[in-house]
Every structure is written in structure tokens, then in C-alpha cells.
């Protein structure tokens, strides 16, 4: 706390501006109006205060809005936002994607900080969904904004926000994430034509079930290895040898590469060997020639 | 500019772990593989395993089984390999090398870290 | 395991002459797994041809790959001074993976 003490005369700030820069921490605090600091928030940040000054003008602003700031100060705190604390931003109520931008500019470049989780929890909370436009700010600012929210979370994202994703926003992103995430994508993306649809959809596929990529392997989609290592490995068990030839198309050669790598790995032990031969990429590990499979997990569906 | 940049020399005692780290910039982390091969002095190349970053599934060259873990943390796109129980012999340079995923050829390689294990 | 071995383990030669290095398997490999490396004294190796042929990029066209089955061969047509290095050839088609014990290539 900075002790009250009476401004010195002459002393009187009438505008924000640099001169502030020369008054001790007392000084500021006896001699700038909070309302006046209030209405001139935006000048704030051109001027080259030292962090116990900010402090200072934090308390001013603290004394002013004890039940938390307008948004109207919010939009302008500028470096002034570093030093809340999440507390003091669960007081704001944040509704326009502006001052959204404005803070998270402030923090452009660093790790998401606890304020800026906080703040961006505020501001979706009251939204009540990611919004397009809200998940391509997010997203700019923070790429692995998505994949930091639980499935629960991401249920409230609308199909047509997911236009707003780039492949590098999921890089992060779970396989029970992408469970949530692709149907929404599929919704999103289903009026494109085939080779459009799979460039959208191909970042979201580790959540696809093995029908899609049945469908998938119809369509000449040339999936790369990359795609297909981030598939469910349940999805891609049950698909043939014909089947993942036609959906690597010309990659099918990688897997050669990836043969210990799960999920191609599980995928070869199902394979009958003399199919995996039809390759001619020497996988190893397949079903050997005489071999009746059994699968019981059918069988204790029948029984 | 691709670059795998990796963690500064170590000289550890025989029993002890080493960890080092491969950082990777300039291109997708998650399209490619990341393999460790190691040089002891004057002698040729060791392939030890490799790590798939998107999926975090590893495999290791049996010589190094039960000694050696590889782990990835995406959001660094930095790759770690950790090796235990180290004995004299493992005293070497020990390389981080990128694989595209779906290929078996090493692109682009760290500059290597100089492990020495020394009583 | 595949054990690969080069062959010489030394080669002096001049600037200007062609060098060619083997690379032997203890069995067979498929030609799209084998890969060449150059290493210089206190440096990272370096990519020079994979798939037994194909040039990696940046690599001059007076290095060449060939070969099949058990037996691989890398050619410099006309030694540069700054082909005076290591190389290790590296198989993926059978696991472990492994690679060669080295051919010097020093002046002569």
C-alpha cells in the first residue's frame, strides 16, 4: 500500500503524459486523479513508466473499480494488463473481440499465462461458444490454443468455426480431442468436392472411424505417412491390404519406414502375410499362409 | 532455415544417466520422425531408435533396450534421449537426426552432443 | 542384423581422379533402403544419396549410387578437394537399422 499523503503544488496532474515519468511512486499516487488515469488509459502505454510506477497506477485503477474495470479501461490497459493477476480479471466482464485482441497483443510471443487463460475463459464463457471469429484470434495469437481444451470443452465449438482451423492448430491435439473434433469437421466440410475436402479434413482424421477411411481409399487421396501414423489404431485394424494401398496411393512405400511405429505395426499382425507379400516392401510379421483367424470378439457378440 | 539444435556437453560418472536434448525450428515438427545415432571416438555410426513426435511411440535398437527413453515435448518441439546405467564404452557423440516419416534416410542432423562417461 | 562392410576402409587418391566405394551386405537389401553419408572431421554427417541413387539435395551430380541385392556401390567421378571425407553407407531394410564401418577418402 502507498501511504496517503497530499500532493505537493503545482504538482496537480491535468493529462497523462511524460512528465509522469519524473514523479516518485507517492507522488503519483497523491497527485493523478484515478478518473482522470481512467479516461486516459490509452496514453498510458507510450509512456515509459518503471513497474513500480504501473503498480501505483494499477492501485489507482484498483480503488476505483473495486468490483473490476469497465471495458472501456480494459481495451486500453496495454502493459498495465501484465501486471493483473487472475483474480483481478475474474472481476471484468469481456464481450468484444477488440479489447480481446488488444490484451492478447500485449502478451504476443510469451507462453499463455495464467491471466491470459483466465481472460480467455471470461471472454468464451460469456460468448457461450468459440465463435469463427473468436477461435481464428485465438488461434493466431496461441496455435495450440484448441488442443488445450478438454472434449468437454470443445463440444461447444460449432462446426462452422472449425473453417477457422489450420493444420498447425492440432499438432498438440489428443486422439480423444480429435473424437470431438472431427465430426464437427466432417459437418463443416461435407458440400466440398474430393480432393478439397480431403486437404480440410486431412488434419482432423485422427478422430475418423474406419468407415471414412474406407471412403477415403475410393477417392485417390494420396494420404502422406505423417496422416496416416496419426490415425486410431482401432480405426485402421479392420482395413485390408488393398484397402491402405489405395489410401497411401504413392506413400504406401513408407510403410515400410514406420513398420514398428504403431499403428502400422498392429495393422501388419492382422495382415495375412501373403497379402503384405503383394506390397513388395518386405513388411514382415503378418499372418503366415495356412493360419485360420479366428476373431472371438465377433464371436462373444453371436454367443 | 531447418536446424536441430542440441544440449552441450556432458561427462557423467559410470552408473549414472545422461539426458540430452535436440531442439528442431523450421519446419513441421510432427511430419518427421526423430532418430538418435550415436559415434564413439574414431569408430563409425550406431543407430539407437527413433521417436514419432506427433505420437510420442518410440523404438529402440535392442542393444540399448531397458537403458535408453526417448521422449518428445511438442509444444517445445524438443526431443530428449536418456540413456542409464552408463558404462566407459558409451562415451561418444551422440546425434539427433530428423527422418521425414515414411522414409528411412536421415536429412538433416544435430551437431551432436559429446558424452563422456569417465571415473 | 544386417552387417554392412565397406570396402576399402582407406582410399588415397588425387583431385581429379574417380573414386569408387562398395558397400556389402551380410543379406540381401531392397535398394530403396539404402542410403550414403559424408562425415568431415568434427562435423554432423550429411545426406548425400538415398534409394540406392537418388541425390540428396544440394549434393554435386559427380556423386553417384547404384547396386542391389547384397552389393551397393558409391562413385565421385572427379574428386574435389572438399570430397576428402568419410562415408558410411545405411540400410532400413531390416531391423536394427545399421550402417557401414567407413571409407576414408584421403589425399594422396
Known amino acids: 500500500e502507498v501511504e496517503k499523503t497530499a500532493c505537493p503544488s503545482g504538482k496537480k496532474a491535468r493529462e497523462i503524459d511524460e512528465s509522469l515519468i519524473f514523479y516518485k511512486k507517492w507522488e503519483l499516487e497523491a497527485c493523478v486523479d484515478a478518473a482522470l488515469l481512467a479516461t486516459q488509459m490509452d496514453r498510458v502505454n507510450a509512456i515509459p513508466f518503471t513497474y513500480e510506477q504501473l503498480d501505483v497506477l494499477k492501485h489507482k485503477l484498483d480503488e476505483l473499480y473495486p468490483q473490476g474495470y469497465p471495458e472501456s479501461v480494459i481495451q486500453h490497459l496495454g502493459y498495465l494488463f501484465l501486471k493483473m493477476s487472475p483474480e483481478d480479471i475474474r472481476k471484468w466482464n469481456v464481450t468484444s473481440l477488440e479489447t480481446l485482441k488488444a490484451l492478447l497483443e500485449v502478451n504476443k510471443g510469451h507462453e499463455m499465462s495464467p491471466q491470459v487463460a483466465t481472460l480467455i475463459d471470461r471472454f468464451v464463457k460469456g460468448r457461450g461458444q468459440l465463435d469463427k471469429d473468436t477461435l481464428d484470434t485465438l488461434t493466431a495469437f496461441y496455435p495450440g490454443y484448441l488442443c488445450s481444451l478438454s472434449p468437454e470443452e470443445l463440444s461447444s465449438v460449432p462446426p462452422s468455426s472449425i473453417w477457422a482451423v489450420r493444420p498447425q492448430d492440432l499438432d498438440t491435439c489428443d486422439p480423444r480431442q480429435l473424437d470431438v473434433l472431427y465430426p464437427k469437421a466432417r459437418l463443416a466440410f461435407q458440400n466440398m468436392n474430393g480432393s478439397e475436402y480431403f486437404v480440410k479434413i486431412q488434419s482432423f482424421l485422427g478422430g475418423a472411424p474406419t468407415e471414412d477411411l474406407k471412403a477415403l481409399s475410393q477417392q485417390n487421396v494420396s494420404m502422406d505417412l505423417a496422416t496416416f501414423m496419426k490415425l486410431r489404431t482401432d480405426a485402421v485394424l479392420p482395413l485390408t491390404v488393398a484397402e491402405v494401398q489405395k489410401l497411401l496411393g504413392p506413400h504406401v512405400e513408407g510403410l515400410k519406414a514406420e513398420e514398428r511405429h504403431r499403428p502400422v505395426r498392429d495393422w501388419i499382425l492382422r495382415q495375412r502375410q501373403d497379402d503384405l507379400d503383394t506390397l513388395g516392401l518386405g513388411l514382415q510379421g503378418g499372418i503366415p499362409n495356412g493360419y485360420l483367424v479366428l476373431d472371438l470378439s465377433m464371436q462373444e457378440a453371436l454367443s | 532455415e531447418v536446424q536441430l539444435v542440441q544440449s552441450g556437453a556432458e561427462v557423467k560418472k559410470p552408473g549414472a544417466s545422461v539426458k540430452v536434448s535436440c531442439k528442431a525450428s523450421?519446419?513441421?515438427?510432427?511430419?518427421?520422425?526423430m532418430d538418435w545415432v550415436r559415434q564413439a571416438p574414431g569408430q563409425g555410426l550406431e543407430w539407437m531408435g527413433d521417436?514419432?513426435?506427433?505420437?510420442?511411440?518410440?523404438i529402440y535398437n535392442q542393444k540399448f533396450s531397458g537403458r535408453v527413453t526417448m521422449t518428445e515435448d511438442k509444444s517445445a518441439s524438443t526431443v530428449y534421449m536418456e540413456l542409464s546405467s552408463l558404462r566407459s564404452e558409451d562415451t561418444a557423440v551422440y546425434y539427433c537426426?530428423?527422418?521425414?516419416?515414411?522414409?528411412?534416410?536421415?536429412?538433416?542432423w544435430g551437431q551432436g552432443t559429446t558424452v563422456t562417461v569417465s571415473s | 542384423e544386417i552387417v554392412l562392410t565397406q570396402s576399402p576402409a582407406t582410399l588415397s587418391l588425387s583431385p581429379g581422379e574417380r573414386a569408387t566405394l562398395s558397400c556389402s551386405a551380410s543379406?540381401?537389401?531392397?535398394?530403396?533402403?539404402l542410403s550414403w553419408y559424408q562425415q568431415k572431421p568434427g562435423s554432423s554427417p550429411r545426406l548425400l544419396i538415398y534409394r540406392t541413387s537418388n541425390l540428396a539435395s544440394g549434393i554435386p551430380a559427380r556423386f553417384s549410387g547404384s547396386g542391389s541385392g547384397t552389393d551397393y556401390t558409391l562413385t565421385i567421378s572427379s574428386l574435389e578437394p572438399e570430397d576428402f571425407a568419410v562415408y558410411y553407407c545405411h540400410q532400413w531394410s531390416s531391423f536394427p537399422y545399421t550402417f557401414g564401418g567407413g571409407t576414408k577418402v584421403e589425399i594422396k
Open positions: 523450421g519446419y513441421t515438427f510432427t511430419d518427421y520422425n
Open positions: 543379406s540381401s537389401v531392397i535398394s530403396s533402403y
Open positions: 521417436i514419432n513426435p506427433s505420437t510420442g511411440g518410440t
Open positions: 537426426a530428423r527422418r521425414r516419416i515414411g522414409t528411412g534416410y536421415f536429412d538433416v
